[in-house]
Interface confidence: medium
C-alpha cells in the first residue's frame, strides 16, 4: 500500500479552496502551522488551518447538513403537500354537489318551499364545510336546525297552506312540535348518524395529513447543535487542513457521525411508523357511512324520504299540531 | 319519488369524459396515498444513511478518511470515528431530541391516539329499527350502513358517485338564483368533465 | 446563467439604518444557501452573513451580531440584509454570493457589489 501524499508543503491547495469559501486569504496560513489553538481539526503535525477556518467550516457544515436534510425530506413534503391540498379541495366539490343536488331535489319537488329550503341547505352545508376545515360545530345541531328550519315551512307551504306564514309566533311553536312529535319518523338520527360519522372521519383524515406536513416541516428545519457542528466539520473538512483535497470520509465513519448528529430526529421513526399505519387503517375503514363522499350525494334522497314520511302522517300530525300550536294560530288569525 | 340529480342533470349523450379509464373516485386516490405513504414508513431510521449517500463518501476509492488520519477503507480504523479525548458520541445521544422534535412526537402521539379511536372496529351504529319511533315506519333496515337512500325507491344508491377527476359543472341556477323555480331539463344542462385535481406521484 | 444585482447602497449618517437587495436569477434560488460580504478600502473581503436554502437558520460575523439582520424570499428570488445602527465602519462594497452545493466544483458566484458608505 503506498503511503498517504505529504501534506502541501505551501498551502497553496488549501488556500485556494478555502478562497471559494471564504472570501480573502488572511485566516489561511501560507506555509503549514503547528495549529495550537485548533479545536475541532486537532493536528498530529503541522496544519493549513486556522481557528477562523475552523469557524467557517463548522458553519459550512452545518449549511450542508441542513440542505441534505431538506432535500432528503422533498419528495415525502411535495407528497403530503399536494394530497392535503387535493383532497380539502375535493371535498369541497363533494359538500357543493351534495348542496346542488339537494337544492335541485327540491326544486323539482317541492318547488312553493324552494326559496326558504335552498336559504336553509346552503347554510346546513356551509356548517359541513366548516366542520370539515376544523370549526367547533355540533353535527347534530346542524341537522336539529335543518329540520326545525324546513318543518314550519313544510307545514304552511305544503300541509296546512292556508296559513299565512309569516308568523313567527306559530313557527316558534312548529319548531317545537317537530322535536316533540318526531314529526319526520326517525330521519333526521338517521342523517346525524351518518353525517356525523363521515364528517368526523374526514375531519380526522385532513387533520393527519396537515400534522404530517408539520411534522416534514420541524424536523426539515432543525438547528443542529455545536457538538454535531464539529462532527460534521471533522469529517467532511478536517482533511482539508493536511492538504487531502480529494480525500472522502469512509462510509462506516459517516454512519456512525449522522446516527449522532440525527439520534433526536431518529426517535420520530416509532411514531412516523405509528402514524402512517393509523392513517392506513382509517383509510380502510372510510366507506359506507364512514365515507363522506357516499353519505353527503345521498343526502338529497334521504331528506326527500323524510318530506314524503311527513306526507304520508299529514292528517294525524295536522290534527296534532293543531291542538298544540292552536294558542299561536288564535293569536295569529284575530 | 324524488327525481335524481342525474337524471335531471346529466344527458348521458353529451356527457365528455377527459380520458378516465377506470372510475377514479377519492376513496381510490386515498388508497394510493396511503401506499405511497407506505414506501416512506421507515424515512426517519433511514435519514443517517440517506444522508451518507447523498453526500461525499469513499466508496471505490482505497484509502478514506476516518476524522483524524487517511485509512484503508477496509481497516478497523475506518469504522472507528477518530473522536478519542473529544466529545462523547454517546453524550450526544444521551442529550435526548429537541425540544421542537418532542412537541412534534407529542403531537404524532395525539393524532395516532384520534386515529385508532376513529378506526375501531365499526359494530353497527343504530340497533333500533326507523320504525320504533315517530309516526309510522320508514323503510330503512337496522342496519344503516346500508341505509342511505332511506326509503321511496327502496335502497337508492347514489348511481353517479361523484368522479375524483371530474368536476360536475353545473349549469342550473340552483347556487345563485334560490327564487327560481323553472323545471331543469336534461338537454338544458351538458356537463363537461375535466381533470380539475393535478394528479400527484 | 448565473446572475446577482445588489442594490440599496448609499450614503448614510451613523446611527442610522439601511436595508441591500439581491436579486438573483439563473439558478433555483431556494436551493442555495446565500451569503453577503463585505470589503472596506484597501482591506481584505470579510464575511458578513449566511442564510439557509429555506431561511430557517441564519449565521453572522460575531462583530456584527445584533445589528445585521439576514433574511430571504424565495418567492421573489432576492437576498435582504438589514443593516442597523451603522458606523464609520461598516463603509465597504458590499457583495451577495451564492454559496456552493455540497459536492459542487469549487468556483462560486458574486453580484458586482454596492456601496455602502456612512459618514456624517
Known amino acids: 500500500q503506498p503511503p498517504p501524499p505529504p501534506p502541501d508543503a505551501t498551502c497553496h491547495q488549501v488556500r485556494s479552496f478555502f478562497q471559494r469559501l471564504q472570501p480573502g486569504l488572511k485566516w489561511v496560513p501560507e506555509t503549514p502551522v503547528p495549529g495550537s489553538d485548533l479545536q475541532v481539526c486537532l493536528p498530529k503535525g503541522p496544519t493549513c488551518c486556522s481557528r477562523k477556518m475552523e469557524e467557517k467550516y463548522q458553519l459550512t457544515a452545518r449549511l450542508n447538513m441542513e440542505q441534505l436534510l431538506q432535500s432528503a425530506s422533498m419528495e415525502l413534503k411535495f407528497l403530503i403537500i399536494q394530497n392535503a391540498a387535493v383532497f380539502q379541495e375535493a371535498f369541497e366539490i363533494v359538500v357543493r354537489h351534495a348542496k346542488n343536488y339537494t337544492n335541485a331535489m327540491f326544486k323539482n319537488n317541492y318547488p312553493s318551499l324552494t326559496p326558504q329550503a335552498f336559504e336553509f341547505v346552503g347554510e346546513f352545508f356551509t356548517d359541513v364545510s366548516l366542520y370539515i376545515l376544523g370549526s367547533d360545530i355540533n353535527v347534530d345541531d346542524m341537522v336539529n336546525e335543518l329540520f326545525d328550519s324546513l318543518f314550519p315551512v313544510i307545514y304552511t307551504q305544503l300541509m296546512n297552506p292556508g296559513l299565512p306564514d309569516s308568523a313567527l309566533d306559530i313557527n316558534e311553536c312548529l319548531r317545537g312540535a317537530r322535536r316533540d312529535l318526531k314529526v319526520f319518523g326517525n330521519f333526521p338520527k338517521l342523517i346525524m348518524t351518518q353525517v356525523s360519522k363521515s364528517l368526523q372521519v374526514t375531519r380526522i383524515f385532513l387533520q393527519a395529513l396537515n400534522l404530517g406536513i408539520e411534522v416534514i416541516n420541524t424536523t426539515d428545519h432543525l438547528k443542529f447543535s455545536k457538538d454535531c457542528g464539529r462532527m460534521l466539520t471533522r469529517m467532511w473538512y478536517c482533511s482539508y487542513c493536511q492538504g487531502l483535497m480529494m480525500v472522502k470520509p469512509c462510509g462506516g465513519y459517516c454512519n456512525v457521525v449522522m446516527q449522532g448528529c440525527m439520534a433526536g430526529v431518529v426517535e420520530i421513526d416509532k411514531y412516523w411508523r405509528e402514524y402512517i399505519l393509523s392513517l392506513e387503517e382509517l383509510v380502510n375503514g372510510m366507506y359506507r357511512i364512514y365515507d363522506m363522499e357516499n353519505v353527503l350525494l345521498g343526502l338529497f334522497s334521504t331528506i326527500h324520504d323524510s318530506i314524503q314520511y311527513v306526507q304520508k302522517n299529514a292528517g294525524k300530525l295536522t290534527t296534532t299540531i293543531g291542538k298544540l300550536c292552536a294558542h299561536s294560530q288564535q293569536r295569529q288569525y284575530r | 319519488s324524488a327525481y335524481y340529480p342525474e337524471d335531471l342533470f346529466i344527458d348521458k349523450k353529451v356527457l365528455k369524459v377527459a380520458h378516465v379509464e377506470h372510475e377514479e373516485t377519492l376513496s381510490s386516490r386515498r388508497r394510493e396515498l396511503i401506499q405511497k405513504l407506505k414506501s416512506f414508513i421507515s424515512f426517519y431510521s433511514a435519514l443517517p444513511g440517506y444522508i451518507c449517500s447523498h453526500s461525499p463518501v469513499a466508496e471505490n476509492d482505497t484509502l478514506c478518511w476516518n476524522g483524524q488520519e487517511l485509512v484503508e477503507r477496509y481497516s478497523q480504523k475506518a469504522a472507528r470515528n477518530g473522536m478519542k479525548n473529544q466529545f462523547n458520541l454517546h453524550e450526544l445521544k444521551m442529550k435526548g431530541p429537541e425540544p421542537v422534535v418532542s412537541q412534534i412526537i407529542d403531537k404524532l402521539k395525539h393524532i395516532n391516539q384520534l386515529l385508532r379511536t376513529m378506526s375501531m372496529p365499526k359494530g353497527r351504529v343504530l340497533d333500533k329499527n326507523l320504525d320504533e319511533e315517530g309516526f309510522e315506519s320508514g323503510d330503512c333496515g337496522d342496519d344503516e350502513d346500508e341505509c342511505i337512500g332511506g326509503s321511496g325507491d327502496g335502497m337508492i344508491k347514489v348511481k353517479n358517485q361523484l368522479r375524483f377527476l371530474a368536476e360536475l359543472a353545473y349549469d342550473l341556477d340552483v347556487d345563485d338564483a334560490p327564487g327560481n323555480s323553472q323545471q331543469a331539463t336534461p338537454k338544458d344542462n351538458e356537463i363537461s368533465t375535466f381533470h380539475n385535481l393535478g394528479n400527484v406521484h | 446563467q448565473v446572475q446577482l444585482v445588489e442594490s440599496g447602497g448609499g450614503v448614510v449618517q451613523p446611527g442610522r439604518s439601511l436595508r441591500l437587495s439581491c436579486a438573483a436569477s439563473?439558478?433555483?434560488?431556494?436551493?442555495?444557501?446565500m451569503s453577503w460580504v463585505r470589503q472596506a478600502p484597501g482591506k481584505e473581503p470579510e464575511w458578513v452573513s449566511s442564510?439557509?436554502?429555506?431561511?430557517?437558520?441564519?449565521y453572522y460575523a460575531d462583530s456584527l451580531k445584533g445589528r445585521f439582520t439576514i433574511s430571504r424570499d424565495n418567492s421573489k428570488n432576492t437576498l435582504y440584509l438589514q443593516m442597523n445602527s451603522l458606523r464609520a465602519e461598516d463603509t465597504a462594497v458590499y457583495y451577495c454570493?451564492?454559496?456552493?452545493?455540497?459536492?459542487?466544483?469549487?468556483?462560486?458566484?458574486w453580484g458586482q457589489g454596492t456601496l455602502v458608505t456612512v459618514s456624517s
Open positions: 439563473g439558478f433555483t434560488f431556494s436551493s442555495y444557501a
Open positions: 454570493s451564492r454559496d456552493p452545493r455540497f459536492g459542487e466544483p469549487p468556483f462560486d458566484y
Open positions: 442564510i439557509s436554502g429555506g431561511g430557517s437558520s441564519t
